[in-house]
């Protein structure tokens, strides 16, 4: 059932990874015997090296036997390999970076649960910091649009700088500058909100540096099922941060008696890491995974960048898809607590709830609920990947395609359980949730694997964007919106107000649905859109004269 | 010009119960906070009671000493807002006045930048 | 709950004087106090807000200054209508506390 393709048996999976490393020994061994000659010229200027005959390219998927290029004599001749620093030349393999690689992963999704631990640490003490300013829901409101607003904007900016300067140090100043930001953020005076609405949106963009930028590091360190399972990792940071963001928030603040202490924990955590950043992660080159190294000097101009991004179906519906999970999760982050509150209430066994915060144990609840399924969901996701890559290449935005559905089926089953069951409806929120979220770390593979080396931090930032913008930032005042144009025409009861929120949450599983539909639409260009991506990132590998991207 | 006007207060004996009425005019009552503040005969000044705005949810904060028994609400259509006393002790005796809390529409002060002239409650046997 | 003490409790001038008045909080409160005058058989009325900003209608000899526990609340060349009784309040945690008073007199 996971399969939706497992009848075509492709070249893929485990087979494939024995392949390819088959063939990098075998071009380790010819790039050993190949000596200097002393006749390498100088390459021309923003020219990639051509390689020697008959070589191959290892890319996202396997590998491309490429034509012979270049008269001898010239860079990246067999002559040459040991000093050009063409294809032919020995490469930092990524063999090479052994347990460097693993560390710099594992650095790199420490950051992100930092990224996630200081978004949430705010969530988890925002009442009191409400409180203390004096923020009404209005407000708080701005303080949440301010903050993705500043997201979104920055995201394609960072994607744009990512793709064409020195990445780590891009995402060391991203962590050092929200570290200081929210550090600043715990000195603000009562009376200037604005300038906490200010300090919300500057974190904002420090931290899409690091969300838009740390994946791609990650694309160009390691490839195929290796990308799954780093990505899965990497990704599993969200819910993880997101988890240990409201116990720091809330555990803090009991500690120091005062909640401007919990915004002085994760800046610390940020600036040592910040520095592991730069101390650790290698300085990779784009495509180096892909056994390109130094060859992908082609730059492009971003608005070619994003006309090619448009172009890309797969990539375009997997971000539209994306944003259906966001949406989903934005609005069900949002109201969920307050729904199974109410639901309490009309099965009378809660009070109903005059004087915030309303379900602050549902919250609870549902945090951990978050916590657990982000991780069983990654988890379950690349499990799932990675044996259906074993029948098909469609296997990536088939298993999302299925997770989408799946989810959207127990989202339904929410609504239903809550009327009777509140258990029930936790159970149904546990499986839709692990299947909504399986799909996280596999989009990110779908990207790596449809985008070029070259482009892809400009395509996690547009899709950051995308999600954001059709998604998260305004599924929450959307779903608000819904339930209060419903009451308004019913009587004024605790039945009415929960189903009136109710109804206005059922828009989350169509959503879902038009999510799993995306994927599926993914699924028919997924195999072209890849191919096409290897052929280009075999182009760059030509001489200047020949790159048509 | 932002008017606050008390009503409502007298001599009640221990126990009993009493409302307190502030109207108010000059302002958009339904986006500000309200408080009330009381001053016992030759004491200082103690916060009592604050009611949040609609976009607030209408959230009411007390002070220890009258939690539980103090109630207070708002009325936006009429532009009041009210302080229901119940088991009335005799160190409830003061003057009690309606104050407003600055509004900044996102946001609101704590502070109070306008009061009433202030009610009598005296509970007394 | 935050504390504040007010210092003196009483303090004796004659008018056209110069003078400052102390409000101590029990903890750290960033600037997060406000003045209050109370004239006899009158309602508070606001002077200072968060420690230092001037409310408009006071005059301009209420001067505010201060920050963390110590702050203080100045009266340069005290007139007549001064006399009275100053009140700070603390809004820097629920819930919202007033000080004891400095009563001001004539020498």
């Known amino acids: 059932m996971m399969c939706l393709e497992c009848a075509s048996a492709a070249a893929g999976g485990a087979e494939e990874e024995e392949a390819d490393a088959e063939r990098r020994r075998r071009r380790r061994g010819a790039q050993r015997g190949a000596g200097g000659s002393g006749c390498c010229g100088a390459r021309g200027a923003g020219g990639a090296g051509v390689s020697a005959a008959g070589d191959e390219v290892q890319t996202l998927s396997g590998s491309v036997r490429r034509a012979p290029t270049g008269p001898p004599g010239t860079p990246g001749t067999p002559g040459c390999a040991a000093t050009a620093k063409g294809p032919g030349a020995q490469q930092p393999k990524p063999a090479s970076l052994g347990r460097g690689r693993g560390a710099a992963a594992a650095i790199l999704s420490l950051g992100n649960v930092l990224n996630y631990l200081d978004r949430y640490t705010v969530a988890g003490v925002l009442l009191d910091i409400a409180q203390h300013f004096g923020v009404k829901d209005r407000g708080a409101g701005l303080l949440q649009s301010v903050f993705i607003c500043s997201f979104m904007v920055a995201a394609p900016i960072f994607g744009y700088l990512g793709d064409r300067f020195n990445r780590k140090v891009i995402l060391s100043c991203g962590i050092f500058f929200w570290s200081a930001v929210t550090f600043s953020s715990s000195f603000i005076p009562q009376q200037y909100f604005w300038l906490l609405v200010l300090s919300r949106g500057l974190v904002g963009i420090g931290e899409a540096s690091y969300s838009t930028i740390a994946p791609t590091i990650i694309g160009d360190l390691f490839t195929k099922n290796t990308r799954t399972l780093m990505l899965s990792v990497f990704y599993f940071a969200i819910p993880l941060g997101s988890g240990l963001g409201y116990i720091t928030g809330s555990s803090v603040k009991q500690a120091a008696g005062d909640w401007h202490w919990a915004l002085r924990v994760s800046p610390v955590l940020g600036m040592i890491t910040g520095t592991l950043i730069l101390i650790l992660v290698p300085a990779t080159k784009r495509g180096h995974a892909d056994q390109l190294g130094d060859q992908l000097k082609a730059r492009t101009s971003w608005l070619r960048d994003m006309k090619a991004l448009i172009r890309n179906r797969s990539y375009v519906f997997s971000s539209l898809a994306t944003s259906a999970v966001s949406f989903a999760t934005g609005a069900l982050g949002m109201w969920i607590p307050l729904y199974l509150h109410r639901a309490q209430v009309v099965q009378k066994t809660a009070e109903t709830c005059n004087s915030p915060p309303c379900g602050a144990k549902d919250s609870l609840i549902f945090g951990a609920i978050t916590c657990f399924t982000g991780f069983l969901g990654v988890v379950t996701g690349a499990g799932a990947t990675r044996w259906c890559r074993l029948k098909t290449q469609r296997a990536d935005p088939l298993v999302c395609a299925v997770g989408m559905l799946g989810s959207a089926i127990f989202i339904c089953l929410i609504f239903v359980a809550a009327k009777s069951s509140i258990v029930g409806a936790y159970i149904c929120i546990f499986v839709g949730e692990t299947l909504l979220f399986s799909n996280w770390a596999i989009t990110a593979d779908i990207l790596m694997y449809v985008v070029i080396p070259t482009r892809r931090a400009t395509a996690v930032a547009l899709q950051s964007f995308t999600s954001h913008l059709l998604g998260d930032a305004g599924s929450p005042y959307l779903i608000g919106f819904i339930s209060d144009l419903i009451r308004q025409s019913t009587k004024d009861s605790p039945l009415w107000e929960f189903l009136s929120l109710g109804y206005a949450l059922m828009l989350c599983p169509f959503v879902v649905v038009l999510g799993g539909m995306f994927f599926l639409a993914t699924a028919l260009f997924f195999v072209s859109d890849r191919a096409r991506a290897e052929q280009q990132v075999n182009q760059l590998a030509m001489p200047p004269a020949s790159v048509k991207v | 010009e932002v008017q606050l006007v008390e009503t409502g207060g007298g001599l009640v004996r221990p126990g009993s119960s009493l409302k307190l009425s502030c109207a108010t005019s000059?302002?958009?009552?339904?986006?500000?906070?309200m408080s009330w503040v009381r001053q016992a005969p030759g004491k200082g000044l103690e916060w009592v009671a604050l009611?949040?705005?609609?976009?607030?949810?209408?959230?009411?904060n007390y002070a220890e000493s009258i939690k539980g028994r103090f109630t207070i609400s708002r009325d936006d259509s009429k532009s009041r807002v009210y302080l229901q006393m119940n088991t009335l002790r005799d160190q409830d005796t003061a003057t009690y006045y309606c104050?407003?809390?600055?509004?900044?529409?996102?946001?609101?002060?704590?502070?109070?930048?306008?009061w009433g002239q202030g009610v009598m409650v005296t509970v007394s046997s | 709950d935050i504390v504040l003490t007010q210092s003196p409790p009483t303090l004796s001038v004659t008018p056209g004087e110069s003078v400052s008045l102390s409000c101590r909080a029990s903890?750290?409160?960033?600037?997060?106090i406000h003045w209050y005058q109370q004239r006899s058989n009158e309602s508070p009325r606001l002077l200072i807000k968060y420690a230092s900003q001037s409310i408009a209608g006071i005059p301009s000899r209420f001067s505010g200054s201060g920050s963390g526990t110590d702050f203080i609340l100045s009266i340069n060349r005290v007139e007549s209508e001064d006399f009275s009784v100053y009140y700070c309040?603390?809004?820097?945690?629920?819930?919202?506390?007033f000080g004891p008073g400095t009563k001001l007199e004539v020498k």
């Open positions: 903890q750290g409160i960033s600037t997060s």
């Open positions: 309040q603390q809004t820097y945690s629920l819930p919202l506390t």
């Open positions: 009611i949040k705005d609609k976009n607030s949810n209408s959230e009411a």
């Open positions: 104050t407003r809390h600055e509004d900044f529409y996102y946001y609101s002060g704590y502070y109070f930048d306008y």
């Open positions: 000059g302002f958009t009552f339904s986006d500000t906070w």
